[in-house]
């Protein structure tokens, strides 16, 4: 197991949360483990208990403060350790010097709403949640629309290469039920990844007027 495929992956949501996943082949499910955060230039330390999410995978969230507080900056380094109890002592299983703004994953966009809907198009807006003001406008979005008879995986991705919190979907079919999702990613960070997809927004296009197509 020591030479197995263990992984220790963490992401910063850009404000006050570091989420970590620890996976360890051959580990006992009831092993008690935690993540400890030790910043290089802050007075606080933080710990969270790793809870099982699958057979050999555990996760936890380091809550650094109020959700919208800016707890870390681009110059911060946070040493993250996985500690597991072995008998009466804690054993260090993994260590990394974590650069928060190189490992970003924002919260999923929220407050999706239909601004205007017609027979063939729909204008949708959303908001970003708990995103640092440091990004200014340096964000990008991906969106997808679920059409009847298709899966999310089949939906083509629409890319918005700027901080644009709305989209106008076109060439839709009249009187049809759709679902829409969006996700966000900062441009900054070597290991930065996409946010989770937003909760789906369901909407229905208007029926075509009798005798004409609007």
């Amino acid at each position: 197991a020591v030479n197995g495929t263990s992984q220790f992956t963490c992401f910063y949501n850009s404000r006050a949360n570091i989420s970590c996943v620890w996976s360890q082949d051959g580990a006992l499910q009831d092993t008690s483990c935690q993540v400890h955060a030790w910043p290089d230039r802050r007075r606080w330390n933080q710990t969270c208990e790793l809870l099982p999410v699958s057979q050999a995978s555990w996760a936890c969230n380091l809550i650094l403060g109020a959700p919208d507080s800016q707890k870390l900056t681009t110059v911060d380094i946070v040493t993250l350790r996985v500690l597991c109890r072995e008998g009466v002592r804690w054993r260090v299983m993994a260590i990394q010097d974590f650069k928060p703004f190189e490992n970003l994953r924002l919260m999923a966009p929220i407050s999706l709403q239909v601004v205007h809907v017609e027979t063939h198009r729909c204008n949708i807006s959303w908001e970003i949640s708990q995103a640092s003001h440091y990004f200014e406008r340096h964000l990008e979005f991906e969106a997808r629309t679920l059409s009847p008879g298709h899966t999310w995986e089949e939906a083509p991705l629409l890319t918005l290469k700027q901080k644009q919190e709305w989209i106008c979907l076109e060439t839709l079919t009249p009187d049809t039920q759709y679902e829409f999702q969006v996700r966000v990613k900062p441009l900054q960070g070597e290991f930065t990844t996409w946010s989770p997809w937003s909760q789906p927004l369901a909407f229905r296009t208007k029926p075509a007027a009798l005798g004409k197509d609007t």
Partner: nanobody, 127 residues
Framework: QVQLVESGGGLVQAGGSLRLSCAAS????????KGWFRQAPGKEREFVAA????????DYADSVKGRFTITRDNAKNMVYLQMSNLKPEDTAVYYC????????????????????WGQGTQVTVSS
């Protein structure tokens, strides 16, 4: 690409000390870990020590714990291995290696995790 060049090896008597250096150049990673491995004649390459990007975390093989110290100087792109109280069984070619993921610890000692390697420097400890 990444280039790693080791130096500082040599012949030393048992109980003596050596300091190995590793100079890194080329592509940089935002938070890599660096480590030292060694390979004695007829044996497999084995983990010796590793250090996190900012040097705030270290990991050592049980066989060298308390005798070897790994440090790094990011301003100079250097990693060092201070070896004290050397034993004949420390005789090997010592390799510097880089792990872009930046995680170290007992479950991260496999050489497969290290993507970039130096050519090695010979350390011989005579009794």
């Amino acid at each position: 690409q990444v280039q790693l060049v080791e130096s500082g090896g040599g012949l030393v008597q048992a109980g003596g000390s050596l300091r190995l250096s590793c100079a890194a150049s080329g592509r940089t990673f935002s938070s890599d870990a660096k480590g030292w491995f060694r390979q004695a004649p007829g044996k497999e390459r084995e983990f010796v020590a590793a250090i996190t990007w900012a040097g705030r975390g270290t990991d050592y093989a049980d066989s060298v714990k308390g005798r070897f110290t790994i440090t790094r100087d990011n301003a100079k792109n250097m990693v060092y291995l201070q070896m004290s109280n050397l034993k004949p069984e420390d005789t090997a070619v010592y390799y510097c290696a880089l792990n872009p993921e930046g995680v170290i610890g007992p479950y991260f000692r496999n050489s497969n995790r290290y993507n970039y390697w130096g050519q090695g420097t010979q350390v011989t400890v005579s009794s």
